[in-house]
C-alpha cells in the first residue's frame, strides 16, 4: 500500500483557498477506502490535530469543528481511492504538516498508510489599483472614474499590480469589461486582453482580431504598471473596466498554482458614438433665383465630434433631386475624407465650387444657375473612424432636411417653319431646304442653333430607326456635319439672323426621306458655360428626288 500526496512544501496565501490531493494504491480490501486528515502545527510538531475524515463525522478536533460544520473545510471524494482536502479561506495557523492517513483494510500490514506534505501560509501582499492612463479621454473626478471617449478615439487604461511576497512568484494581469451596471463576477466579466505570467499577451475571444490587427495593445511599463490601449473605440466597448491580477507560484512538482487573485475597478467608460452626435443643417432657406445668377448653399456639420485627424475623418457632399423625383437624386459635388473635391456626373465643365469655409461649414457655389439646377438640395455628411491601422470605417452618416431651390425659366418660345425651295427636285440637282425661326422672350444675347435631321423610308414605310443628323450650325456659329444618306456633299449655313439653309448636292435616290429642322436657343453665362433655354421642331419636309425623263 502507498499513500500519495503532493510534494512539498506548498506555499499558499492567507485568505485564499487550497486543495491538497491524496490517493492510495496497492491496497487490499474494498474499492472505497477511507481517509483521515491531520495537521501538525510548527509549534507542536508531535501533536496530530484531526481535521476531517471520510468515515467519522465527529472526527474533527475543536480547532476545526466549526469550520468543518460550516463547510469551509471539507474532504471531497474524487473516487474510491482518491480524495482532496479543501480549505476555503486559509488562516496563518493553518500552516504546518498535513498528513493523509488511510485506515488499514489489508490482511497484512504492508507499505505506508499515510503521506505528509508541508503547507506554508504566506501573508496577502498582492495589491491592485487603477493607474492614471495618461492624457486620454475626459475623466470625471469620481471613484471609480467615469470616462467618455469618442468613437474611433483611443481608450487607454492603466493598472498598478504589485506583490511583495518573499517567495519567487509571477504576476498575470488581465483587463476585463462588464456591461454597465452589471454585477461583477467571472461569468459577467469578459476578458479583453491579458498578460500572462510568462509575459505572453492574449486577448479574449471577441478581441483577438483587434489584437492581431494592432488595434488593441497591452504593455508593461516599469515594474508594476500595465497599460491597455484600445485603438479605435467602438460602441460595444462601453462598460465597466476591471483589472485582475493573479499571483502564481511553481510547486515542487513543477506545476504552477495560482495563490492569489485581486481585482480593481478601473473606470466606467462611455463611448460617444458618431451616429448619436452627427447632425447636418443647411441654409439659407428656400432659394428663388434667376438663370445665370450664382447659387450659394451652406452646410453645417454639428455635434460633439472628434476633430478630423488621426482617428476621425469626414466627407461632405451635396445631392440634388429634381422636383418630385424620389430618392437622394444625384451627386452635385463632394469633398472627400482627404479634402479632394469632385463634381458629380453632368456637372463637369461647369464653374462649381465646393469648399470648407469654417471648421464645420461647407459651401456649394454654382457660378451660374440654370433652370435644370432647380430641385431639392440636401447635404450629406459621413463620419469615418480609423483604428490604429490606416483603414477608415464608415461610422455614421446624416442628411440635412431638403432645401428647395427654384430657378426661373428663361421663357423662350421658338417656332420653326421649314420648306423645300422650288418644291420639286430632280436627281443630280441640289436640294435647298430652308428653315425660318421665330423667337419670343429670352434675355439679350440669346444665340440660336439649328440642326437638320432625316428619317428615311424602308420599303415605302418610314423606318423605326431614329432620325439621323444630317448637319447643323451650333450657337457658336460652327457647322457640324452628320451623315448624308446618299453620301454626297452637304452644306449648312446661316442665310439670315433667323434663317438656316441645308443644301444636298447631287441628289440621289438614297436622299429620299422626311427632313426636319430643330432649332435651339442658348444662353451663355458669366462662367462661359452654355445652357439650352428652349427648343423646337419644324414640320416635316419631304424630299423625293424625281428622275428626269432622260433618265428612263
Amino acid at each position: 500500500r502507498e499513500v500519495l500526496v503532493p510534494e512539498g512544501p506548498l506555499y499558499r496565501v492567507a485568505g485564499t483557498a487550497v486543495s491538497i490531493s491524496c490517493n492510495v494504491t496497492g491496497y487490499e480490501g474494498p474499492a472505497q477506502q477511507n481517509f483521515e486528515w491531520f495537521l501538525y502545527r510548527p509549534e507542536a510538531p508531535d501533536t496530530a490535530l484531526g481535521i476531517v475524515s471520510t468515515k467519522d463525522t465527529q472526527f474533527s478536533y475543536a480547532v476545526f469543528k466549526s469550520r468543518v460544520v460550516a463547510g469551509e473545510v471539507q474532504v471531497q471524494r474524487l473516487q474510491g481511492d482518491a480524495v482532496v482536502l479543501k480549505i476555503a479561506r486559509l488562516q496563518a495557523q493553518d500552516a504546518g504538516i498535513y498528513e493523509c492517513h488511510t485506515p488499514s483494510t489489508d490482511t497484512r500490514y504492508l507499505g505506508s498508510y499515510s503521506g505528509k506534505v508541508e503547507l506554508r501560509v504566506l501573508p496577502d501582499v498582492l495589491q491592485v489599483s487603477a493607474a492614471p492612463p495618461g492624457p486620454r479621454g475626459r475623466q470625471a473626478p469620481t471613484s471609480p472614474p467615469r470616462m467618455t471617449v469618442h468613437e474611433g478615439q483611443e481608450l487607454a487604461l492603466g493598472c498598478l499590480a504589485r506583490t511583495s511576497t518573499q517567495k519567487h512568484t509571477h504576476l498575470a494581469v488581465s483587463f476585463g469589461r462588464s456591461v454597465p451596471e452589471a454585477p461583477v463576477g467571472r461569468s459577467t466579466l469578459q476578458e479583453v486582453v491579458g498578460i500572462r505570467s510568462d509575459l505572453a499577451v492574449e486577448a479574449g475571444a471577441p478581441y483577438a482580431e483587434r489584437l492581431a490587427a494592432g488595434e488593441l495593445r497591452l504593455g508593461k511599463e516599469g515594474t508594476d504598471r500595465y497599460r491597455m490601449v484600445v485603438g479605435g473605440a467602438q460602441a460595444g466597448d462601453a462598460g465597466t473596466y476591471h483589472c485582475t491580477a493573479a499571483e502564481w507560484i511553481q510547486d515542487p512538482d513543477g506545476s504552477w498554482a495560482q495563490i492569489a487573485e485581486k481585482r480593481a475597478v478601473l473606470a466606467h467608460v462611455d463611448v460617444q458614438t458618431l451616429s448619436s452626435q452627427l447632425a447636418v443643417t443647411v441654409g439659407p432657406g428656400e432659394r428663388r433665383i434667376g438663370p445665370g445668377e450664382p447659387l450659394e448653399l451652406l452646410c453645417n456639420v454639428s455635434g460633439a465630434l472628434p476633430p478630423a485627424g488621426r482617428h476621425a475623418a469626414y466627407s461632405v457632399g451635396w445631392e440634388m433631386a429634381p422636383a418630385g423625383a424620389p430618392g437622394p437624386g444625384r451627386l452635385v459635388a463632394q469633398l472627400d475624407t482627404e479634402g479632394v473635391g469632385s463634381l458629380g456626373p453632368g456637372y463637369e465643365g461647369r464653374h462649381i465650387a465646393m469648399e470648407k469655409v469654417a471648421s464645420r461649414t461647407y459651401r456649394l457655389r454654382l457660378e451660374a444657375a440654370r433652370p435644370g439646377d432647380a430641385g431639392t438640395y440636401r447635404c450629406l455628411a459621413k463620419a469615418y473612424v480609423r483604428g490604429s491601422g490606416t483603414r477608415l470605417r464608415e461610422a455614421a452618416s446624416a442628411r440635412s432636411r431638403p432645401l428647395p431651390v427654384h430657378v426661373r425659366e428663361e421663357g423662350v418660345v421658338l417656332e420653326a417653319v421649314a420648306w423645300l425651295a422650288g418644291g420639286t427636285v430632280y436627281r443630280g440637282e441640289t436640294a435647298s431646304l430652308l428653315c425660318n425661326i421665330s423667337v419670343r422672350g429670352g434675355p439679350p444675347g440669346l444665340r440660336l442653333a439649328a440642326s437638320w435631321w432625316v428619317e428615311r423610308p424602308e420599303d415605302g414605310e418610314l423606318s423605326s430607326v431614329p432620325a439621323q443628323l444630317v448637319g447643323g450650325v451650333g450657337q457658336d456659329g460652327v457647322a457640324e456635319l452628320g451623315v448624308r444618306p446618299g453620301g454626297g456633299p452637304v452644306s449648312v449655313e446661316l442665310v439670315g439672323p433667323r434663317s438656316h439653309r441645308l443644301r444636298l448636292h447631287s441628289l440621289g435616290p438614297e436622299d429620299e426621306g422626311v427632313y426636319h429642322c430643330a432649332p435651339s436657343a442658348w444662353v451663355q453665362h458669366a462662367d462661359y458655360s452654355w445652357y439650352q433655354a428652349g427648343s423646337a421642331r419644324s414640320g416635316p419636309v419631304t424630299v423625293y428626288p424625281y428622275m428626269h425623263a432622260l433618265d428612263t
Partner: antibody
Framework: EVQLVESGGGLVQPGGSLRLSCAAS????????MSWVRQAPGKGLEWVSG????????RYADSVKGRFTISRDNSKNTLYLQMNSLRAEDTAVYYC?????????????WGKGTTVTVSS | DIMLTQSPGTLSLSPGERATLSCRAS???????LAWYQQRPGQAPRLLIY???YRATGIPDRFSGSGSGTDFTLTISSLEPEDFAVYYC?????????FGGGTKVEIK
C-alpha cells in the same frame, strides 16, 4: 448626342504596333479625364490607361506600362492609345470611356469598342 | 492593388424576381468610390451606379446600390427581360482602378 467612336483595331503580329483613336462628340471633351478599358475574349473588364483633361497626369496598368502610351488632342476631340511590343495577351476589345470626377465616380460614356487581335 | 470579389458568379432568376449582387473589396474603399456597370452581350458596359449608391442618369429606379467599407451590394428590385446581363463593380479608391470578375444574371 454624346458619343465616343473607337477605330484603329485590327490583326497584328506579336511585337508589332497599333494606334487606336477615339473620336468624341456631343460634349466638351477637354472637361473630362479619359480612359481606355479592355476586355479579353470571354473575360472581364480591365482598366488599361487614363489621361488628365489637359493631357497630363497619365496612368497605366502594370501590364502595359512601358509599352502603351495614352495621349489626346483636345483641338480634335480625339483620344489615342499607341500600343507597341504587342503580346498575345493584349488581344481584346478596347473601349474608350469618359471618366467622371477623374474616374472617382466611374465611367459614364463608353464607345462600342475596337478589336485588337495579336497573333502570328 | 485592391481586389474586388463578386458573388455569386452566376445568378439564375426569373423575370419579376429580386436580384442581389455582392461585391467585396480586399481593403476598405474610401469615400465609397465604387461604381456598378451592366454589360449586355456584344455591347459596351453601361454605368448604373456611382458613389456606391447614386443612380446614373437615365437608370431606372429598380436598380439601387448600397454598402460601405469593404461590402457593397447592387439590388435589382424586380428583374425585367433586358436586365439579364453581366454586372461588374469597379473601384477608384486606390490606383490602379480595378474591376470585379462580374456576376452573370441569367434567365432561370
Amino acid at each position: 448626342e454624346v458619343q465616343l467612336v473607337e477605330s484603329g483595331g485590327g490583326l497584328v503580329q506579336p511585337g508589332g504596333s497599333l494606334r487606336l483613336s477615339c473620336a468624341a462628340s456631343g460634349f466638351t471633351f477637354s472637361s473630362y479625364r479619359m480612359s481606355w478599358v479592355r476586355q479579353a475574349p470571354g473575360k472581364g473588364l480591365e482598366w488599361v490607361s487614363g489621361i488628365g483633361r489637359s493631357g497630363g497626369r497619365t496612368r497605366y496598368a502594370d501590364s502595359v506600362k512601358g509599352r502603351f502610351t495614352i495621349s489626346r488632342d483636345n483641338s480634335k476631340n480625339t483620344l489615342y492609345l499607341q500600343m507597341n511590343s504587342l503580346r498575345a495577351e493584349d488581344t481584346a476589345v478596347y473601349y474608350c470611356a469618359r471618366a467622371i470626377a477623374a474616374g472617382r465616380y466611374g465611367m459614364d460614356v463608353w464607345g462600342k469598342g475596337t478589336t485588337v487581335t495579336v497573333s502570328s | 492593388d485592391i481586389m474586388l470579389t463578386q458573388s455569386p458568379g452566376t445568378l439564375s432568376l426569373s423575370p419579376g424576381e429580386r436580384a442581389t449582387l455582392s461585391c467585396r473589396a480586399s481593403q476598405s474603399i474610401r469615400n465609397n468610390y465604387l461604381a456598378w456597370y451592366q454589360q449586355r452581350p456584344g455591347q459596351a458596359p453601361r454605368l448604373l451606379i456611382y458613389g456606391a449608391s447614386y443612380r446614373a442618369t437615365g437608370i431606372p429606379d429598380r436598380f439601387s446600390g448600397s454598402g460601405s467599407g469593404t461590402d457593397f451590394t447592387l439590388t435589382i428590385s424586380s428583374l425585367e427581360p433586358e436586365d439579364f446581363a453581366v454586372y461588374y463593380c469597379q473601384q477608384r479608391s486606390n490606383w490602379p482602378p480595378t474591376f470585379g470578375g462580374g456576376t452573370k444574371v441569367e434567365i432561370k
